[in-house]
């Protein structure tokens, strides 16, 4: 293959591969906990936003989807499933109503939502 | 790698790979002809929509982007850059205004537009 071309992955079959990360958008609406369980069952996690450059495909994503960001009531912080803290200036997250989970929307926006509300979701698997 | 996982591609570096097709979304606004030339310079063509199943990632694309669909005034048909005719029931084409080129919008919609209007665009490369 030409030097300018390369393979991406490995990823689960029929997932999107971009800059060696794997993504899948799931159409069925589930609450946050069910969405998390669905991703975990596929050796993945809910979407983690860690880089505007490496994840610029997310700019153009339509609609709202659960991502792996949750509120930790004990200290009031927001963190990803892996325990890492939300980095500043990565996402513009708005709390329009009470909630402890977050939806991803286009242009690196997030909406805080009640975790028990069903929504579509994005799973992500980082390749090594 | 696990049997359930696979590599995707090959694709140009940092393009999106999905079901062995390569896609790239370009931010800069160009007219249709410039967009076509840009894709060709990267050994690709403007987006061709050929399958709702194989290209279901396009459902979630936000905004409007040039694709490779053009009007042939001599016979009144719409065809892709490669000369193939637009298959029925693939795209819902909406004639917002007079034009011979088409923009792709989410949920498999196409908007007819004047070819000289600048817009963002999607390049696509089909892997063998």
């Amino acid at each position: 293959i030409p030097l300018t071309e390369s393979y991406c992955g490995p990823c689960p079959k029929n997932w999107i591969c971009y800059k060696n990360n794997c993504y899948q958008f799931f159409n069925e609406s589930k609450n946050w906990y069910e969405s998390q369980a669905s991703c975990m069952s596929q050796n993945a996690s809910l979407l983690k936003v860690y880089s505007k450059e490496d994840q610029d495909l997310l700019k153009l994503v339509k609609s709202y989807h659960w991502m792996g960001l949750v509120h930790i009531p004990t200290n009031g912080s927001w963190q990803w499933e892996d325990g890492s803290i939300l980095s500043p200036n990565l996402l513009t997250i708005i709390e329009m109503q009470k909630g402890d989970c977050a939806l991803y929307a286009s242009s690196f926006k997030g909406y805080i939502e009640n975790c028990s509300i069903p929504n579509t979701y994005i799973c992500m698997q980082r390749t090594v | 790698i696990p049997l359930t996982e696979s590599y995707c591609g090959p694709c140009p570096k940092n393009w999106i790979c999905y079901k062995n097709n390569c896609y790239q979304f370009f931010n800069e606004s160009k007219n249709w002809y410039e967009s076509q030339a840009s894709c060709m310079s990267q050994n690709a063509s403007l987006l061709k929509v050929y399958s709702k199943e194989d290209q279901d990632l396009l459902k979630l694309v936000k905004s409007y982007h040039w694709m490779g669909l053009v009007h042939i005034p001599t016979n009144g048909s719409w065809q892709w850059e490669d000369g193939s005719i637009l298959s029925p029931n693939l795209l819902t084409i909406i004639e917002m205004q007079k034009g011979d080129c088409a923009l792709y919008a989410s949920s498999f919609k196409g908007y007819i537009e004047n070819c000289s209007i600048p817009n963002t665009y999607i390049c696509m490369q089909r892997t063998v």
């Epitope: 009031g76 912080s77 927001w78 939300l86 500043p88 200036n89 513009t92 997250i93 708005i94 709390e95 329009m96 109503q97 009470k98 929307a105 286009s106 242009s107 690196f108 926006k109 805080i112 | -």
Partner: antibody
Framework: EVQLVQSGAEVKEPGESLKISCKNS????????VGWVRQMPGKGLEWMGI????????RYSPSFQGQVTISADKSINTAYLQWSSLKASDTAMYYC????????????????WGQGTLVTVSS | EIVLTQSPATLSLSPGERATLSCRAS??????LAWYQQKPGQAPRLLIY???NRATGIPARFSGSGSGTDFTLTISSLEPEDFAVYYC?????????FGQGTKVEIK
């Protein structure tokens, strides 16, 4: 220094259209949401809606949905509020404001306000 | 939508006195409530957010308390510049809403 500067007072007749502006400076316009609040003469405050200038995502309060249009031009750090056909009942002071950021999250309070634009609709 | 009811409508006090303003929500808003001050001819100013946090630059004589449906703004010792209209606002549910205001006037 964060500043929101609104366009000047307007006197219009019923049925006319109008677009008022809110120029933002001193912060990253696309990292926050901006909103509009109405205050009718001698009355309290009412939320109209909010906009994210990064991609013009907009949320309207149900009572203002379809009555006004909120927009933004991120290239000039300006938010707008417009009417296609004014009514006498649109007579009010209109304030724009920037939503607060707390622990990295945008929350629904204005920490900075414009000076207000008085709109008078009368025949 | 959530209705906020402020009381009293008017509070007549002298400088140096303690002012206690009340805001009651039609349903629980948790601690998602703010207080603003508005003087004639001016835009409102954020005083307290999320029930008890003082906004930047707000003097310590202003304090907020409460959660659920009942909230209080207290001004421990009124200064001449504190005579104004005070509004509460909830952000617990969209659309966000304001109370109708309490006017604190000089007795």
């Amino acid at each position: 220094e964060v500043q929101l500067v609104q366009s000047g007072a307007e006197v219009k007749e019923p049925g006319e259209s109008l677009k008022i502006s809110c120029k933002n400076s001193g912060y990253s316009f696309t990292n926050y949401w901006v909103g509009w609040v109405r205050q009718m003469p001698g009355k309290g405050l009412e939320w109209m809606g909010i906009i994210y200038p990064g991609d013009s995502d907009t949320r309207y309060s149900p009572s203002f949905q379809g009555q006004v249009t909120i927009s933004a031009d991120k290239s000039i750090n300006t938010a707008y509020l417009q009417w296609s056909s004014l009514k006498a009942s649109d007579t009010a002071m209109y304030y724009c404001g920037r939503l607060t950021m707390f622990r990295g999250i945008i929350i629904g309070y204005f920490d900075y306000w414009g000076q207000g634009t008085l709109v008078t609709v009368s025949s | 939508e959530i209705v906020l009811t402020q009381s009293p409508a008017t509070l007549s006090l002298s400088p140096g006195e303690r002012a206690t303003l009340s805001c009651r929500a039609s349903q629980s808003v948790s601690s998602y409530l703010a207080w603003y001050q508005q003087k004639p001819g001016q835009a409102p100013r954020l005083l307290i957010y999320d029930a008890s946090n003082r906004a930047t630059g707000i003097p310590a004589r202003f304090s907020g308390s409460g959660s659920g449906t009942d909230f209080t703004l207290t001004i421990s010792s009124l200064e001449p510049e504190d005579f104004a209209v005070y509004y509460c606002q909830q952000r617990s549910n969209w659309p966000w809403t304001f109370g109708q205001g309490t006017k604190v006037e000089i007795k």
